[in-house]
């Protein structure tokens, strides 16, 4: 029962450019290119795009011209290969155009980068960006979608148009406000903060497709789906699951025109049919496309069916289990996920997939057995410290950021993973500690019933960007090790891993603990980046140093900055005073 | 509207053969354990059998060989085949659906019944 | 297979009597009992699942117990409309179901 369009068509282009219309055909090829060519300027991405565009219209007009039956991934590889400077810019991934189609694709693929080698973008003046705006409203949003998806390689496209929509009309609000910067920098900083945040969501589906398959993604999508919509039968579920799994893989492969063309039809197939999914899609379903896909996405979970009976008499105390499950794997499998998470809310995606996974394992074994009725009797016992570990964790860690404030609790968080992980480069421990300790703030303000979910598939999302960071220039084999053998269990792996024992202590360097009087023109974000970089490369030069000693060091380094950013000669006073900070902190650690 | 609608009943000579139908709206079938249970004028509630999500199905110990439950998804309807009919076979017949995909019960949802009846 | 015996097999009572059924299996189903009301040329109606949860909808007049073996159906104050068959059923221990004989509650 899928909902998207089977029926042939002689030119894909063509139909991609009818469905989606001019203006997110263009978007859509843009971001397309800006994800597969990186560092390519912007000018030149357009002119590709233009050059597309008019050859896909040529193809409205006739859909038997020339080259207008060719794949879309032919069509826009053939045009990507046209880059002059390919092999200057690019080096090894010029090689993919001597390829043909699907390996070119493929090859593309391989090449994204999710780190980019790219300047930081700054935000210049309001009244500088509202002239640009009104200049040249076109050119401007362009500009946007380009800078987004090149530092971005895995942005949902089809979100991309969503938050693109949202820029336009910050833009259009704020620069007829009397006030503009007051109007327009908050509203830029909240796209800016949900758009990393949407970016490093959609980079783990990606992840979870292409390196645990297809079927990991549906499991996780069942789970999801299950809780979101718990009055849904199974059938419906898993036939969204089948079209969302469609979507994101397209999307997740560079076919950008399919993939939001499908979610649209996703999106229209869920509102027509809302009185068997949900009854909270109400509100979504009135707003136009861009927002109601995204609303739908974000739609809170609907209240659970009265009167369901316990899990145990079909999946524990049937004798009938072995065969039900020998007979019809998948679904049986499905359904216990299914109906275990819809009962659920409370947990988070992770961990009823752990369930589902030690379930399946118990009847692996059990069904094997000579009592298997016996063997699998117990197997919800089992279940028990799967749930109780995470639980615990988080309540032991919303104490610990409550008592510290998200400052100091990140702080304790980057000297936790730096002395697990210490070969991992500084910038990204830094990054990712951050990111890791944002969980607080955005998760322990929550009831209980609340907190796991927010919580542990949050910090899948924060882990899936040290992975694929990690992966990129891979240094330490206990990370590849927690990343590569689970997906569903990569934050428990890292939550086990002890401080390496076998790390060799980097050398002191001086340099790294050598500040300036530039420190004391940054915003607050900035600086507190600069004192957790120096903290990582204290902890990776005395990995045994105690939180006290830390500590300490750390009290002092602020009051370091503090004074010398009051200083008339601040760069003097950097300059001396960082010379005594510098051996009072190796006397005091003892390096 | 959730509902079920069973049809196909009437009167039939001993030996011989009826398929019921029971018509689901509302609900996709394919996503239950169906379930068929029958009622003799002024007896007890006796259940027959029923078909899982995947698609197995399960008889009472009485009812294997002479009745087999099938469906058909597409046209969301479940059916049950009675073979060589005997007097005592006389009976309302309902279709009933299970609280999940691998559930033998509780039974929330039923039809309004069929009548069945054997003589000749 | 298992068995349910329900007694009384009938039951007459006056409005605002509390009146209790009981099923006992042949051996343990857990807490995998349901007990339903049927009134003439009508299906079943569940009131009661898994042994002690009260179907929505149903008045809290109706109330289930029991576990392993045996089971209790209450209907703590008579109402007019509660005069009907009751039936209870065993389900959960293997993808087969049985149903107890039925009591007819009626008009004393």
């Known amino acids: 029962r899928g909902v998207f369009r089977r029926d042939a068509h002689k030119s894909e282009v063509a139909h991609r450019f009818k469905d989606l219309g001019e203006e997110n055909f263009k978007a859509l090829v843009l971001i397309a290119f800006a994800q597969y060519l990186q560092q390519c300027p912007f000018e030149d991405h357009v002119k590709l795009v233009n050059e597309v565009t008019e050859f896909a219209k040529t193809c409205v007009a006739d859909e038997s011209a020339e080259n207008c039956d060719k794949s879309l991934h032919t069509l826009f590889g053939d045009k990507l290969c046209t880059v002059a400077t390919l092999r200057e810019t690019y080096g090894e991934m010029a090689d993919c155009c001597a390829k043909q189609e699907p390996e070119r694709n493929e090859c593309f693929l391989q090449h994204k980068d999710d780190n980019p080698n790219l300047p930081r973008l700054v935000r210049p003046e309001v009244d500088v960006m509202c002239t640009a705006f009104h200049d040249n409203e076109e050119t401007f949003l362009k500009k946007y979608l380009y800078e987004i998806a090149r530092r971005h390689p895995y942005f949902y496209a089809p979100e991309l148009l969503f938050f693109a929509k949202r820029y336009k009309a910050a833009f259009t609000e704020c620069c007829q406000a009397a006030d503009k910067a007051a109007c327009l920098l908050p509203k830029l900083d909240e796209l800016r903060d949900e758009g990393k945040a949407s970016s490093a969501k959609q980079r783990l589906k990606c992840a979870s497709l292409q390196k645990f398959g297809e079927r990991a993604f549906k499991a996780w999508a069942v789970a999801r789906l299950s809780q979101r919509f718990p009055k849904a039968e199974f059938a419906e579920v898993s036939k969204l699951v089948t079209d969302l799994t469609k979507v994101h893989t397209e999307c997740c492969h560079g076919d950008l025109l399919e993939c939001a063309d499908d979610r649209a039809d996703l999106a229209k197939y869920i509102c027509e049919n809302q009185d068997s999914i949900s009854s909270k899609l109400k509100e979504c379903c009135e707003k136009p496309l861009l927002e109601k896909s995204h609303c739908i996405a974000e739609v809170e979970n609907d209240e659970m069916p009265a009167d369901l009976p316990s899990l145990a008499a079909d999946f524990v105390e049937s004798k009938d289990v072995c065969k039900n499950y020998a007979e019809a794997k998948d679904v049986f499998l499905g359904m216990f996920l299914y109906e275990y998470a819809r009962r659920h809310p409370d947990y988070s995606v992770v961990l009823l997939l752990r369930l589902a996974k030690t379930y399946e394992t118990t009847l692996e074994k059990c069904c094997a057995a000579a009592d298997p009725h016996e063997c699998y009797a117990k197997v919800f016992d089992e279940f028990k410290p799967l749930v109780e570990e995470p639980q615990n964790l988080i309540k032991q860690n919303c104490e610990l950021f409550e008592q510290l404030g998200e400052y100091k609790f990140q702080n304790a968080l980057l000297v936790r993973y730096t002395k697990k992980v210490p070969q991992v480069s500084t910038p990204t421990l830094v990054e990712v500690s951050r990111n890791l300790g944002k969980v607080g703030s955005k998760c322990c303000k929550h009831p209980e019933a609340k907190r796991m979910p927010c919580a542990e598939d949050y910090l899948s999302v924060v882990l899936n960007q040290l992975c694929v960071l990690h992966e990129k220039t891979p240094v330490s084999d206990r990370v590849t090790k927690c990343c590569t053998e689970s997906l569903v269990n990569r934050r428990p792996c890292f939550s086990a891993l002890e401080v390496d024992e076998t790390y060799v202590p980097k050398e002191f360097n001086a340099e790294t603990f050598t500040f300036h009087a530039d420190i004391c023109t940054l915003s607050e974000k900035e600086r507190q980046i600069k004192k957790q970089t120096a903290l990582v490369e204290l902890v990776k030069h005395k990995p045994k140093a105690t939180k006290e000693q830390l500590k300490a060091v750390m009290d002092d380094f602020a009051a370091f900055v503090e004074k010398c950013c009051k200083a008339d000669d601040k760069e003097t006073c950097f300059a001396e005073e960082g010379k005594k900070l510098v051996a009072a902190s190796q006397a005091a650690l003892g390096l | 509207e959730v509902q079920l609608v069973e049809s196909g009943g009437g009167r039939v000579q001993p030996g011989g053969s009826l398929r019921l139908s029971c018509a689901a709206s509302g609900f996709s079938l394919s996503s239950y354990a169906m379930n068929w249970v029958r009622q003799a004028p002024g007896k007890g509630l006796e259940w027959i059998g029923h078909?899982?999500?995947?698609?197995?199905?399960y008889y009472a110990t009485w009812a294997k060989g002479r009745f087999t439950i099938s469906r058909d998804n597409s046209k969301n309807t479940l059916y049950l085949q009675m073979n060589s009919l005997r007097a005592e076979d006389t009976a309302t017949y309902f279709c009933?659906?299970?609280?999940?995909?691998?559930?033998?019960?509780?039974?929330?949802?039923w039809g309004q019944g069929t009548q069945v009846t054997v003589s000749s | 297979a298992f068995e349910l015996t329900q007694s009384p097999s009938s039951l007459s009572a006056s409005v605002g009597d509390r009146v209790t059924i009981t099923c006992r299996a042949s051996?343990?189903?857990?807490?995998?009992l349901a007990w339903y009301q049927q009134k003439p040329g009508q299906p079943p109606k569940l009131l009661i699942y898994?042994?002690?949860d009260l179907t929505s909808g149903v008045p809290s007049r109706f109330s289930g117990s029991g576990s392993g073996t045996d089971f209790t159906l209450t209907i703590s104050s008579l109402q007019p409309e509660d005069f009907a068959t009751y039936y209870c059923?065993?389900?959960?221990?293997?993808?087969?179901?049985?149903f107890g004989g039925g009591t007819k509650l009626t008009v004393l």
């Open positions: 051996e343990s189903i857990n807490s995998r």
């Open positions: 898994d042994a002690s």
């Open positions: 009933a659906r299970g609280a999940g995909g691998f559930s033998t019960g509780p039974f929330k949802l």
């Open positions: 059923q065993g389900y959960g221990g293997s993808s087969t179901t049985t």
């Open positions: 078909i899982n999500a995947g698609d197995i199905a």
